[in-house]
Every structure is written in C-alpha cells, then in structure tokens.
Interface confidence: low
C-alpha cells in the first residue's frame, strides 16, 4: 500500500502549468439575469452539455416565468443559445431534463401550460438536443417522465388525477393504462410495477395497496399483492413491505422472479412509525435498514443471503433520521466490499464505520498520519476519523460535498472529516485515502469542492467560501501535492463544479455567476489539463497493487469475499494521461475458505471482533414465521451461510450441530388465490 | 496560548449604543465559533447569540433580536457584539467565548472552552 | 424555552467535603448537551465538564458530571479551597440556549 506523504515532502511545481492552463481555459458568460441554473450531461463520451436557466418573477395572481436553453458540444467550453428550439416557452425545473439512459441521445423537457390546458406539454430530442419537437400530453404530468432502462422508447409518467401513462414510441403518443396508481416502476425487460388504491386515496390506502404488474406495457396486468404498504426495487430482488393481519405492523417479503412466488423475509416487523430502508443492493444481495421504534434517529443494518430472505444483523445504532430523511451510508465504488457510514452512540455522538468486506465486519476509521485528535477526544492521542456525510450536509454543517469515489480511479476515497472521538461541528478538513478507505491522509486543510478528472490521474478542487473566489487547486499524484491556478481576474460567487459522469474527462467547468449593484451574471469557466498531462501513459508508468492488503506475509492477505485482487495503478510520480478509453487492469485469485466467508445464518450473529456465529439471544427457544415461496419451511442452519459474492474454494466449512429453527407460514398475503390475471379491456 | 481579549469599559447613555469587541489568538478563529453571554450585577449568565466565524451564521436569543448584530472580522481574527437602544437593564459584564458548536448542534456540545476577561458597559443617565 | 433549576441556591461545606450540585431541567435534555461552568468573584466562567459527563481539558479529576434526562449532578469528591465559587449548568440541546440561576458553594 502505497502510504501518505511526509508533511515536509518537497511539491515540485509542474514546468508551465500557469502558461498550458491558461490556454485551455474558456469562459462563457451567460447572456440573461436568471435566478438558478442546471446542467445535464446528454450521452456518454459525447461532449454535449445542455444548460437551462430559470428566471421567475412571482406576481400577485400568476407567476411570469422565463427559461433559457443553452447547449455545449465540446464539453463546455463554448455555448449556443438554442432557446427558440423550445419556441422560448417557459420549462418547469421541478421536472428537471429528463435525459435517456445509456447514450440514446433523448431528452424530454417539460414545459409549464397555462392554467385551463388539457394538459401538458413536452420538448422532445432524439438527437442529443440538436433538435426538439413540441408535443402537446392528453394529462398533466405528476413526476419527470421515465425511461424504461432496456429501450428508451418506452417511457412511463403519473398525471396529477393518478393515471399512469405509458408511450411505446418516446412521448409521440400516449395511452392511460391504469387509474388510481400510487406509484410506478420500470422493472427488467420492460416490466412496469405499480402499485394501486383500492376504494380512497393512496394516502388513506396505505397498507391496503395492490401492487400489480404488467409485462407487456399495459396490454394484461397481474396482481401479485395485496395489503401492500410500499414496494421498490434492489439489484434482481423485488420487495414489498405487507401489512400484518393481526395488528397495525408490516414485514418485508422479497420475490426474485418479478412477483411470481413470495418468501417472507427474516427480517423484524416495523409499526406504523417505523421505517424499512434499502440501503444498497446489487445481483448477490442487499443491505437493509430497518427502523428503531420511537423517534430514536437510528436502526439496525442487516445484510442478506443470496436470496434476499435470510438477514444476518450487520450494524447497531445505524445512524437513519426519518422516512426519506438522511443516513451517511456510502457505497465506496473504487473498491469492492467497501462502505461508510455512521451510528449514534449511547452518548448521542456520531461516529464514523467502515465495512471492508460487504457489511460482515465494520470498524474504526483509521487515524490519519501525523493528526491530532480534536476536543471530541477523551484520549488525546487514540481517537479515529469521522467522514461527513449526508446528515452533517442536512445540519447545515460546512461541508459542501459528500464522500466521493468513483469505479475508475481504483482505491481513491475524498471526504470531509474531523479526527476525534466523534464527528464533531468545527470546521472540517478534507481527508484522502488512495487505498479503500484503510489509510488515511490529510488532503487540504478546510472544506473544499472536489472532483476526480482521467480515472484519478488529476484531483481537482475549490475552497469552499462565502466570498468571491478565482483559485482552482489541482493534484496529479493522487492529493499529496497540490498547485494553484488562478483561473480568471475577476472572482466568481462560485456554484458548482461540472465535469461529465464517469470521471473519465479532462475538462472541469466552474460555474459562478458575478453580481454588480443590480444584475447577477451567471459565467462558467472550463479547463481543460490535456496539455498538463502532455504523454499518454505507458506500461512503466503503471505498478501493481494488491487491494485489501493488510498482513503482507500472510498468504491469505488481501482475501475479501473470497478471492483477492491485483491492480495496476498510475504510480504517483507518473504525470501521464490514462485517457478516454482507460480500462482498470486487475487480477483476481479465489482464495482458501475461511469462517470469514460466512456470514450468520438467520438466528445468529456475530459479537463485536468475534469471527464465530452466536446464536441471537433473543430468538432461543422461539417459535418464528417464515415462508419459503409460500410454503411452510422448517430451516434447518448450522449458523453460517455463505457470504453472497463469496468465491472461495476448499479450505474450511464451518461445522456443527444443524438445528431445526422450527418455523411456521403465517403470511396470507401469499394466498395464491390473491393472484389473478387481468386484461386491459 | 490560546485567549480572547476584550476591548475596555463603557458608560453609555440609554437609547446609545455600545460595540464590544473580542480578539482571538492562538488557534485558527474560523474553525469554532464565538458566544456571548452577559451578567448582571449580582445576577447569573444570560445567553446572548452566537456566531460561526466560519461563514457568518448567526444565532440570537430570542429577547434581543432587533436590539443585537454580531459579526466577525476574520482578517483580524476579531468578533463583535453591537447592542443598541441601551437600557439600564443592559448594564452588565459582557463576555465572549469560544464556541465549538459555532451556534449549531450536531448531536454534542463541547462548552465554552476559553473565556474574554469580560467588558463592563454601564447604561445611565 | 428549556429552564434549568439548580439547587441547592447556596452550599456550605468544609474544604475535604464531598459536594453534590443537582441541576434539573424543565424538559428531557440530550446528556451529550449539558456543560458546568465554575466562577469565582470579577472572573470569567471556566469551562468543567461537557456532555454531562467529560472534564475538559485542565479540569482535575475530583470533579465529576453525571445524569440524564432532566436530571443532571456535578460532585466535587474533596473540596480544595480554590474550589468555592458560584457553579452553573448550561444547556444546548434546544434553542435558545440557557443557563441555571447557579449554586453558591461557599465556605462553612
């Protein structure tokens, strides 16, 4: 593992950088006096922008609104007004620009109708916004159009009467397929979920929804639920959260064949003010919130089994506000198995974890190098790092940016933090750590702006500031030496940063807009850094790097979820373009099964730095509900089950007493006689 | 070391205003926040505001809003308290301090660490 | 608001004594939001222990904060001479932030 810098290490300036930058550097001042602004990346690789800005006057009886549309095709470094391709028609930001999935091109506005329309209206490209046509919608739209991920034709919308709409050729014609929904969903293959209101309201429903479904875009449905509270979608599982029968209680069930056959989930029933949460999930499994009675602030993470059913209790006191309220739990995508998030300790202290191998174990965040501990620190010289994430961002708290990590630039983690017992509220500093999150390092001193250029071979970023700013800062060796470029004379009130998704780009654009007595003038400035990183790289500028390495000489280092991997990586010192088509090189080995590989199996759970499975003390000697498709089931476990995604082979497999958990099927909403076909007459 | 100084006594008149101010040395002045809290003769400490010498925000309490502006200057790394429309029940010891939780709450409050020596402004005809 | 009511209003004790200052608040207050402060006469306050519980940093360890909910104690275990002043509660767990009247722990 590559380990931080010496703080006195000698940052070489890069030769010219001031000349190269300020070539590549375009700005565009936006010729209108609009309140906001947003921008959309249209296509991948594509190098179109389209920006929109809003400019709204709220009068005594209607609101006069005026929007302007400007598109960029080299990454925005130059912009044309293409207003009159929208007839300069006013677009309602709320449904912001609905862009196409993948690089189809397609982009739908909607634009605000006066008040005694039919219904509303839309501006449609298929051609990277190049063009629009207007079309007029026999509804008014209740939320943003969605694309069907499998074929962008396809789009689905609510009407403010509760209509679902569907349009099988990209917004040209419409056809209502169902009243009374409450909520819709594409699923695989063009499957639309929804769920629908029975005799009220989906408010006064709620807990007596129907979840329905259709295959074929409305054509026939099928109801595969009933007593439903709510539903979504994670990686291949469908859940559904049931009322119970008895009381006013729900339970999670989860179908993995698009609701054909059910399985109750083992996970604990929630009453009416809790809350279930799908954290993340992918094809192997899912992590799950589920709620604390009473308005605790917190709950318990549990990760599942290959099917989604059996739940093995994964972290307490998971810091998760409200419904719809704010959890800092953070997928790290630049290393597989890594997450962070934080819990509210006993003391009502927020602190930081991390979970290196899917949600099995979580820690400590480690110390950074040469750092202090701050006043949260009852030892001044043990403490750990505490990221800010969505819930400090929501307290207000000086932290302009979330975690970052992308896929590409493998092990880089950025995010803002403080070093102490606990997150606390001074300012906070922005910490890096080039290998997953196990080391950290002090980045730059104060809350800053960040955003990973060239799959990691620059970092860019901004100080955060309520004054005018006009300094951009930027690193090539992974944010151990950092230049400064004073990108115009005139400072900006700075906004954002834009660089296109993916992290592949070389161009950021700093948008800001600059205010005189009376108008404000929004002004985006774009970098390009090719000419910085002159070369493409080569072979000698890339060295191998073992991910999860912990124990060098143990030849299980570097095992997670059963296999381990190698990586090339840009060396530090190499100022050298990886480029568009850069593609992470890695090795992976399957590694000896450990108990490490297991999780526990429903029933069971593992203590604090423990590696065996103990069984739940409060589920001995309980009868408990489970269903199996449906069915009843008697599980039988010896306690461990092997962890989704888990490749190991040979080595150990736990062994004990397999015992009979004796469950019984208690939920009707798996009645098969609640399941009936319908056709669309 | 780490201290807070602040500016002299004042007599004022009632209906004037006064400005305290409080300098802070030996730590970096935007990273907490600045309180603060007065006294009357023979009385117990009263909350007056706070402010973040981060970004500005204030937090005032609640009978002195309109009366009370706090501000910083993070040049000078020096806070300032302006009362205005003084009464007689304004004469007090007023304190400044530091303020870890800058006027906000993340779930834990540190207390007020380190104290000014306090200003004494006395509101008479 | 949140008041806080300290009592006793006044302590006499001995230099050697154990001291008991209870601080109680007219509703539930987070631990992690309530700090004491010590003041002697024509001093600023001085910081003793945050989060109900912790000694800041400098503060010797015979002073102690303990409690919960709307409940809060500072004991001092051995009473030093430079220990009688004028001792207040403050919390911040709802705006607008408030301090108790004070406990006058005096000498006997």
């Known amino acids: 593992r590559r380990g931080a810098p010496a703080e006195d290490q000698d940052c070489g300036r890069l030769p010219d950088f001031i000349a190269k930058l300020t070539n590549n550097t375009h700005q565009h001042v936006f010729d209108d006096l609009s309140g906001s602004v947003s921008l959309s990346w249209v296509g991948d690789s594509t190098g179109v922008i389209l920006v929109l800005t809003t400019f709204q006057v709220p009068l005594v009886i209607v609101s006069f609104g005026q929007s302007k549309l400007y598109r960029s095709e080299d990454y925005g470094k130059n912009f044309k007004d293409i207003t009159n391709l929208i007839n300069n028609t006013f677009i309602r930001t709320e449904f912001g620009m609905a862009i196409g999935p993948e690089n189809s091109g397609k982009v739908i506005l909607t634009a605000e109708v006066s008040g005694g329309s039919r219904g509303g209206r839309v501006f449609r490209s298929s051609d990277f916004a190049k063009n629009f046509v207007q079309t007029d919608l026999p509804f008014h739209p209740l939320t943003q159009m969605m694309y069907s991920p499998q074929n962008s034709d396809y789009l689905l919308a609510l009407s403010t009467e509760n209509g679902l709409w569907v349009s099988k050729n990209f917004g040209e014609k419409w056809e209502e397929i169902h009243k009374a929904v409450c909520l819709a969903k594409w699923g695989p293959n063009n499957i639309i979920f929804f769920t629908t209101h029975v005799n009220g309201s989906c408010k006064a429903d709620l807990g007596a929804l129907e979840l329905w479904r259709t295959s074929d875009l409305g054509k026939t449905f099928k109801t595969i639920g009933v007593k439903i509270y709510s539903f979504g979608l994670g990686g291949r599982f469908l859940f559904a959260s049931v009322m119970a029968d008895k009381d006013t209680t729900r339970r999670i069930h989860v179908s993995t064949d698009q609701g054909d056959t059910w399985s109750m989930a083992q996970l604990p029933s929630v009453g009416q003010e809790q809350f279930y949460s799908i954290l993340a999930a992918n094809e192997d499994m899912v992590f799950m919130h589920v709620d604390e009675p009473g308005d605790t602030g917190f709950g318990t993470i549990f990760t599942s089994d290959d099917r989604g059913i059996v739940y093995s209790k994964s972290l307490d006191r998971h810091l998760y506000t409200t419904t719809g309220g704010e959890t800092d739990f953070t997928n790290v995508t630049s290393l597989r198995g890594v997450y962070i998030t934080s819990t509210l300790s006993e003391d009502n202290s927020i602190q930081s974890m991390i979970t290196f191998d899917q949600g099995g174990r979580w820690e400590h965040l480690r110390k950074p190098e040469n750092s202090k501990c701050d006043a949260t620190a009852k030892n001044k010289n043990e403490c750990s790092l505490h990221i800010h994430a969505s819930y400090s961002i929501s307290q207000k708290l000086n932290v302009p940016m979330a975690p970052l990590s992308e896929p590409n630039a493998v092990g880089i983690v950025i995010a803002h933090g403080s070093v102490g017992d606990a997150i606390s509220v001074m300012v906070p500093d922005v910490y890096i750590s080039d290998d997953g999150g196990y080391s950290w390092a002090k980045m730059l001193e104060g809350p800053h702006y960040y955003t990973i250029l060239d799959s990691g071979g620059i970092i860019v970023a901004i100080e955060h500031s309520n004054r005018p700013i006009n300094v951009i800062k930027f690193s090539t060796d992974e944010g151990q030496c950092w230049q400064s470029y004073v990108f115009t004379q005139e400072p900006i009130y700075f906004t954002g940063l834009a660089s296109e998704p993916g992290a592949r780009s070389m161009n950021i654009s700093i948008w800001g807009f600059t205010e005189s007595f009376i108008t404000r003038q929004w002004v985006s400035y774009t970098v390009d850094f090719k000419d910085i990183l002159e070369r493409n790289c080569e072979e000698d500028d890339y060295t191998t790097w073992l991910a999860h390495s912990t124990d060098p000489g143990d030849y299980k280092d570097g095992c997670i979820l059963g296999y381990k991997e190698q990586f090339l990586r840009l060396r530090k010192s190499s100022v050298c373009q990886n480029g568009r088509d850069y593609v992470v090189a890695k090795q992976p080995s399957v590694c000896p099964c450990s108990l490490e590989d297991f999780l526990c199996d429903f029933g069971y759970f593992r203590p604090e730095n423990a590696s065996e499975c103990v069984e739940q003390p409060e589920l001995k000697g309980h009868e408990l509900e489970f269903c199996l498709y449906g069915k009843e089931e008697h599980l039988t476990t010896n306690g461990y089950r092997k962890i989704p995604g888990d490749k190991c082979q040979g080595g150990m497999n736990p062994a004990r007493e397999v015992k009979d958990l004796k469950k019984k099927c208690t939920s009707n909403f798996l009645n098969p006689t609640k399941q009936n076909s319908k056709s669309n007459s | 070391q780490v201290q807070l100084v602040q500016s002299g006594a004042e007599v004022k008149k009632p209906g004037a205003s006064v400005k305290v101010s409080c300098k802070a040395s030996g730590y970096t002045f935007t990273s907490y926040g600045i309180s603060w809290v007065r006294q009357a003769p023979g009385q117990g400490l009263e909350w007056m505001g706070s402010?973040?010498?981060?970004?500005?925000?204030?937090n005032y309490a609640q009978k002195l809003q309109g009366r009370v502006t706090m501000t910083t200057d993070t040049s000078t790394s020096t806070a300032y308290m302006e009362l205005r429309s003084l009464r007689s029940d304004d004469t007090a010891v007023y304190y400044c301090a530091r303020d870890p939780s800058g006027g906000t709450t993340l779930h834990y409050y540190y207390g007020m660490d380190v104290w000014g020596q306090g200003t004494t402004v006395t509101v008479s005809s | 608001e949140i008041v806080l009511t300290q009592s006793p209003g006044t302590l006499s004790l001995s230099p050697g004594e154990r001291a008991t200052l209870s601080c109680r608040a007219s509703?539930?207050?987070?631990?992690?939001?309530l700090a004491w402060y010590q003041q002697k006469p024509g001093q600023a306050p001085r910081l003793l222990i945050y989060g109900a519980s912790s000694r800041a940093t400098g503060i010797p360890d015979r002073f102690s904060g303990s409690g919960s909910g709307t409940d809060f104690t500072l004991t001092i275990s051995r009473l030093e001479p430079e220990d009688f002043a004028v001792y207040y509660c403050?919390?911040?767990?709802?705006?607008?932030?408030?301090f108790g009247g004070g406990t006058k722990v005096e000498i006997k």
């Open positions: 403050d919390q911040l767990g709802s705006s607008p932030r408030t």
């Open positions: 402010i973040s010498a981060y970004n500005g925000n204030t």
């Open positions: 509703q539930s207050v987070r631990s992690s939001y």
